[in-house]
């Protein structure tokens, strides 16, 4: 029945038309200046995001925002007076004017006109809420802002203290380097003296070979004479023989008594015919002493002994001095072989040493060293080794040169503190060292960050706790 | 945990044999070098053979060498002594034992099983 | 072979006696002896390992030492359940020998 239309005039003001029957009512209202149109949807959750707004923006955002709060109020005061006003002036109008039965057209447009002023009302409310609802999410990051520029401070200040140290460090390695520099001057300057005298020695030994080429000459001379007479002495041996055997009363009285075999290593062993892996006996150097001991015969052409597994953490390697001399654990799993065997063992003849890693990720890696030896207990069984070759790093995780053997209780290190206790195992520690493959055995998940684990730093860095781990020495001459 | 269990004990003639058995469990048969040590009724204990863990290497003293054999089945985690040629004086307690790893002490033993050997 | 001389051969002590039975080798064998308790009817039971090793569960009254030929096994305070025989053994070298055994009787 009413026909109630909306639209702009050219000067930008809202036109209400009322069409009821014959007449038509027309309301001009004014516009708002600063109120977001139509085209522009406000977003009421702006301000929730992840990241944090820029302060500057922030605080501009929320003078935009008062300023249109403060706009709205002035406009619906302008929309009541102006209500107001026009009801007024309508009213004397349509008194004077209109037939009776406008009146109740009239009402109903006042209706219309007051329940658009609470649709306004109740939208400046909805408004009023959301600048609240940013207002306490800015207070909530100006105060995160703050918090974390703090945290920021502070680690500024950790790292700040941290790279002091480290320039502490340099100067003293710089230092290092260069004695070391001073130290290879001599050495080389030693070595071409040294050069020197060789030459010398090669000229006095050339005159030697000459001297023995000469008397060569003259032994094959004597020599046919005494092949001549072995052949004399060989006719007369044979007649014996000969008449020794007419004789033939008794037998041979003499037995062959069983000999015990003995190996001195796993190389030994597989020289046998000995092939396949296992516990095996071997029997100390010019002793009759025995040991047990797993072989490889099979890794790199097999022969190879093992001193050192570490697989499970089934074995504790915290032991005394006499336990790491001795050796301790099973053959079969986890055991250190023993560090008196071990020394009398590469003090014989030449030996390598292999050290075969492995992670808790499936790699693999080798050390492999071209000469290893022990010094004796004397000396704590140092360890010597020369010519590093392998894919667990191009750096030597043993320092070098050679350390004193400590255990926790026989600390040999160059650390005021007592590395083996720190780091837990028998080790050649140095202050502590890169290396440390009898430490804490720490399952998976649980294997970093530990400063007392299987480590070998120059494959895995320093807090990486490795999975398993084997030492096994061979004859360089295999 | 660890167990030893001899049997095949009893009486037998001079110049018979007999074939002594040790049931082991509680650990990884394989992985150990295992023993025979006896014991004469009111004498001290004496070692009797020793094998590896492959069975390739067997050791004997000179008392019962050429004698006495001893031998292992890692499949069934059994440790047998045959024992031939008996004389009197191999009459014992026969235990079967089990080292620590690198060196013969010996950790575990069985309860035993007498050889009786008489006529 | 090396042999194994246990002495005494037997002893009569009494409870919170401190005793002290000595072995000796006939050829050096470092620290590589072993010592075992039997009582009647049973098998052996490892005391000490590596001349002063004490095995797993053997109480502190039980103290081994000695190295090279000489070695002594010592109970601070002989208490009931001591009383049986004991044995060293060398675990040098194969053949691996007993001593004859020493018998701790009560007093």
């Known amino acids: 029945y009413n026909n109630f239309r909306k639209s702009m005039d050219s000067i930008g003001k809202k036109q209400y038309q009322v069409q009821h029957g014959s007449c038509s009512y027309t309301f001009l209202l004014p516009e708002m200046d600063n109120c977001r149109s139509s085209s522009s949807p406000y977003v009421s959750n702006a301000v929730q995001r992840d990241a944090p707004l820029e302060y500057d923006d922030s605080v501009q955002r929320l003078q935009v925002l008062e300023n249109i709060m403060e706009n709205n109020t002035q406009w619906l005061m302008k929309l009541e007076n102006y209500i107001q006003d026009n009801m007024k002036k309508e009213m004397v109008e349509i008194q004077q004017n209109a037939v009776q039965n406008q009146t109740a057209v009239m009402i109903e447009i006042g209706t219309n006109l007051l329940n658009q002023t609470a649709e306004q009302t109740r939208k400046l409310t909805d408004v009023e809420a959301q600048v609240l609802n940013q207002t306490t999410r800015l207070e909530l990051q100006l105060l995160e802002h703050s918090l974390s520029t703090n945290k920021l401070e502070k680690q500024i200040l950790d790292q700040t203290s941290e790279i002091n140290k480290l320039q502490d460090k340099n100067s003293f390695l710089e230092k290092k380097v260069l004695a070391m520099e001073d130290k290879h001057i001599i050495q080389l300057q030693s070595i071409k003296e040294e050069k020197d005298q060789l030459q010398v020695l090669v000229s006095k030994q050339n005159s030697i070979i000459e001297e023995l080429e000469k008397k060569i000459v003259t032994a094959t001379v004597n020599n046919s004479v005494l092949q001549k007479q072995q052949h004399d002495l060989m006719e007369t041996v044979n007649n014996l023989l000969t008449m020794m055997s007419t004789s033939n009363s008794a037998k041979d009285p003499t037995v062959a008594k069983e000999e015990q075999i003995s190996f001195r290593d796993c190389a030994e062993v597989f020289k046998s015919g000995h092939t396949t892996n296992g516990i095996y006996t071997l029997t100390f150097p010019n002793s009759t002493e025995e040991i047990k001991a797993y072989c490889d015969m099979e890794a790199g052409g097999g022969g190879w002994t093992i001193i050192q597994r570490r697989e499970d953490g089934s074995v504790d390697f915290q032991r005394t001095w006499k336990e790491y001399k001795v050796g301790f654990g099973n053959p079969s799993g986890e055991y250190w072989l023993g560090n008196e065997f071990v020394s009398q063992l590469t003090n014989q003849q030449r030996y390598v040493l292999k050290i075969h890693l492995k992670d808790w990720e499936g790699n693999e890696a080798y050390s492999l060293y071209e000469h290893f030896y022990l010094s004796s207990e004397e000396l704590n069984y140092r360890i010597h080794l020369k010519g590093l070759t392998g894919t667990a790093g191009k750096i030597s995780s043993i320092s070098q040169p050679g350390n004193d053997f400590s255990t926790k209780d026989g600390d040999n290190d160059k650390c005021i503190c007592k590395c083996s206790q720190m780091l837990t195992g028998g080790w050649w520690f140095d202050a502590c060292g890169p290396s440390n493959l009898n430490g804490m055995y720490y399952p998976q998940r649980q294997n970093t960050n530990k400063f007392n684990g299987i480590k070998w730093y120059y494959w895995k860095g320093s807090g990486y706790s490795l999975k398993a781990t084997t030492m096994m020495i061979r004859p360089a001459d295999f | 945990q660890v167990q030893l269990v001899e049997s095949g004990g009893g009486l037998v003639k001079p110049g018979g044999s007999l074939r002594l058995s040790c049931a082991a469990s509680?650990?990884?048969?394989?992985?150990?070098?295992m023993y025979w040590v006896r014991q004469a009724p009111g004498k001290g204990l004496e070692w009797v053979a020793t094998?590896?863990?492959?069975?390739?290497?067997?050791y004997y003293p000179d008392s019962v060498k050429g004698r006495f054999t001893i031998s292992r089945d890692n499949a069934k985690n059994s440790l047998y002594l045959q024992m031939n040629s008996l004389r009197a004086e191999d009459t014992a307690v026969y235990y079967c034992?089990?080292?620590?790893?690198?060196?013969?002490?010996?950790?575990?033993w069985g309860q035993g099983t007498l050889v009786t050997v008489s006529s | 072979d090396i042999q194994m001389t246990q002495s005494p051969s037997s002893l009569s002590a009494s409870v919170g006696d401190r005793v002290t039975i000595t072995c000796k080798a006939s050829q050096d064998v470092s620290t590589a002896v072993a010592w075992y308790q039997q009582k009647p009817g049973k098998a052996p039971k490892l005391l000490i390992y590596w001349a002063s090793t004490r095995h797993t569960g053997v109480p502190s009254r039980f103290s081994g030492s000695g190295s090279g030929t000489d070695f002594t096994l010592t109970i601070s305070s002989l208490q009931p359940e001591d009383f049986a025989t004991y044995y060293c053994q060398q675990h040098y070298s194969t053949p691996p020998t007993f001593g004859q055994g020493t018998k701790v009787e009560i007093k």
């Open positions: 094998i590896s863990v492959g069975g390739s290497f067997t």
């Open positions: 509680g650990f990884t048969f394989s992985d150990y070098y």
């Open positions: 034992a089990r080292d620590w790893g690198l060196r013969p002490w010996f950790v575990y």
